[in-house]
């Protein structure tokens, strides 16, 4: 706010006031004496840069009066009172009343004094984020969406990751006059490294305190990545009975595990049981390829593992044996 | 109804002071300031001053300043201007009046410096 | 001083007609602005304040508009009553100061 003037009557009032769409706004204005000054208001106005005549009046005999007087109103100014408070009301805010208004006393003897007041009429949009569901492109596609609807002005969308990504952001009218719906994408090559992290959508707007944090898990569909895990290249005959997995990552998950080998069926020494095969005692070197093949909605995936079962000493940590 | 009443005719001589009254009725005196204007038929309306009888603060046109001198009296609810030192220029119906801030004027005395 | 000059002086009119009556000020104003009608031998009379509003008991055919420095008052259906001198007054800066009136006649 200015501040007081020193020796003459001075106007207070915000160089600025928000309001909110279709809500009601106070234009808050006041008339500052100092201690030693006297000054008599006669009048109260109100008008709007740029249009002809005023938009409400407070006089002293006469009392208020308005351009549309179902939308204005002088929140203190009282008939057969002091008129030292010209704040003016205003009802359902629309777009186009947003500008630079005056509001001017006219007083004695010091004469008329004025202030400008910028009136921003804004609109709070309501923002959502949602997970674009990919699959394995080799090319960059949206990965995320975010969405602010209905803003006054349009809402300010950034990303916050560590996976990299570029933002491709648009904007339209919103459904009320005056207000932009902001989209914004968070575009990146999809992997499977990707899936399962998140995302953070930013957005900022004068209407709020804080900005909004949304947060996005993202999703990328792709077909198993198969890997087989268990065998240490230290199995050796007459050791313990052993446990080989199928470690399979995918989107969706895994349908199906099928054990074989090059040779085609899994000997009798190999017993599938879903992820994971066991491997029993066996009493002569073996050396197959064993390969796991996994399933899911998208196709299937195999991994390989060469197994040697050799002859030497069993150690008491490794190796297959019969109890 | 508000009535501002003033002396209808003043003849006075050159070189002399002349005090027109202008008694308020029908709305509280106080509240609002009251203001003299003088109309000829060379000049038109002409502002002179205004004082606010509730405080007693006046204000001047630069021309009129030496003049005129402005009071009021509370009590009997009267505001007064004091011509001095008149010449015939000063020849001119003299008004009190709320002006914009009510409808009514006085009836206007007019002065004669002869 | 501001100054308001006001036009025409003089202006001839028939019963019904519409008329208007221009002020401009020397610098902005903004709506304070009054006008006055002065019957002959009467005071004048308050028609209009803040440059649009009128006082209550003037008909609405007399109409204030302007801001700034442009000033108009209209009439309209003229009456035979409205035969008058009418006058503006800006009221934003002391000394006030009053347009030199235009004299509104019959044909």
């Known amino acids: 706010w200015p501040p007081p003037g020193t020796g003459d009557v001075v106007v207070q009032a915000p160089t600025q006031v928000p309001g909110f769409l279709g809500d009601s706004v106070t234009l808050p204005c006041y008339l500052q004496v100092p201690n030693m000054e006297v000054t008599h208001v006669s009048q109260l106005t109100w008008a709007r840069h740029g249009e002809s005549g005023s938009m409400a009046v407070f006089h002293q005999t006469q009392g208020p009066s308005y351009s549309e007087s179902k939308r204005l109103e002088f929140v203190a100014a009282r008939l057969g009172a002091e008129l030292r408070n010209a704040s003016l009301r205003m009802f359902g805010l629309r777009v186009e009343d947003e500008g630079n208004y005056t509001c001017l006393f006219v007083t004695f003897p010091q004469g008329s004094r004025s202030v400008d007041i910028w009136l921003r009429v804004l609109a709070k949009p309501q923002n959502t984020a949602e997970v674009q569901k990919v699959q394995l492109t080799g090319e960059p596609v949206p990965m995320a969406r975010c969405v602010s609807t209905g803003g006054r002005p349009p809402a300010q969308i950034t990303w916050h990751s560590d996976l990299g990504g570029m933002p491709n952001t648009s904007q339209v009218p919103g459904f009320l006059s005056g207000t932009v719906t902001v989209t914004s994408l968070w575009i990146l090559v999809p992997s499977s490294q990707v899936d399962g992290k998140n995302v953070t959508c930013k957005v900022e707007h004068e209407s709020f305190e804080k900005p909004q944090l949304l947060t996005v898990n993202l999703t990328v569909y792709y077909p198993p990545e198969v890997s087989i895990s268990g065998y240490d290249n230290n199995w050796y005959l007459g050791q313990n009975e052993a446990t080989l997995t199928c470690d399979a990552r995918s989107n969706p998950e895994p349908t199906g595990y099928n054990w074989s080998t090059t040779m085609g069926p899994l000997p009798p020494f190999a017993v599938a049981q879903g992820a994971q095969l066991l491997i029993r005692p066996v009493d002569k070197p073996i050396n197959t390829t064993l390969i796991c093949n996994v399933t899911n909605a998208l196709g299937a995936r195999q991994a390989e593992l060469t197994v040697q079962v050799k002859e030497g000493p069993p150690s008491e940590h490794s190796g297959i044996s019969r109890n | 109804q508000v009535q501002l009443q003033q002396p209808g005719a003043v003849l006075v001589r050159p070189g002399a002071s002349v005090k027109l009254s202008c008694k308020a009725l029908?709305?509280?005196?106080?509240?609002?300031?009251m203001h003299w204007v003088r109309q000829t038929p060379v000049h038109g309306l002409e502002w002179i001053g205004a004082i606010h009888p509730g405080s007693g603060v006046t204000a001047y046109n630069q021309k009129f300043k030496g003049k005129a001198t402005l009071t009021a009296d509370k009590s009997s609810s009267t505001a007064y201007m004091e011509l001095s030192i008149l010449t015939s220029e000063d020849s001119a119906v003299y008004y009190c009046?709320?002006?914009?801030?009510?409808?009514?004027w006085g009836q206007g005395t007019t002065l004669t410096v002869s | 001083d501001v100054v308001m000059t006001q036009t025409p002086k003089f202006m001839s009119t028939s019963v019904g007609d519409r008329v208007s009556v221009t002020c401009k000020a020397s610098?902005?104003?903004?709506?304070?602005v009054a006008w006055y009608q002065q019957k002959p031998g009467q005071s004048p009379k308050a028609l209009i304040y803040s440059a649009s509003y009128r006082y209550s008991g003037v008909p609405d055919r007399f109409t204030g508009s302007g801001s700034g420095t442009d000033f108009t008052l209209t009439i309209s259906n003229v009456q035979s009553e409205d035969l008058a001198d009418y006058f503006c007054?800006?009221?934003?800066?002391?000394?006030?100061?009053f347009g030199a009136g235009t004299k509104l006649e019959l044909k």
């Open positions: 009046t709320p002006l914009w801030l009510r409808r009514d």
């Open positions: 007054q800006q009221y934003n800066t002391y000394p006030l100061t």
């Open positions: 610098q902005n104003v903004g709506t304070n």
């Open positions: 029908g709305y509280t005196f106080t509240d609002h300031e």
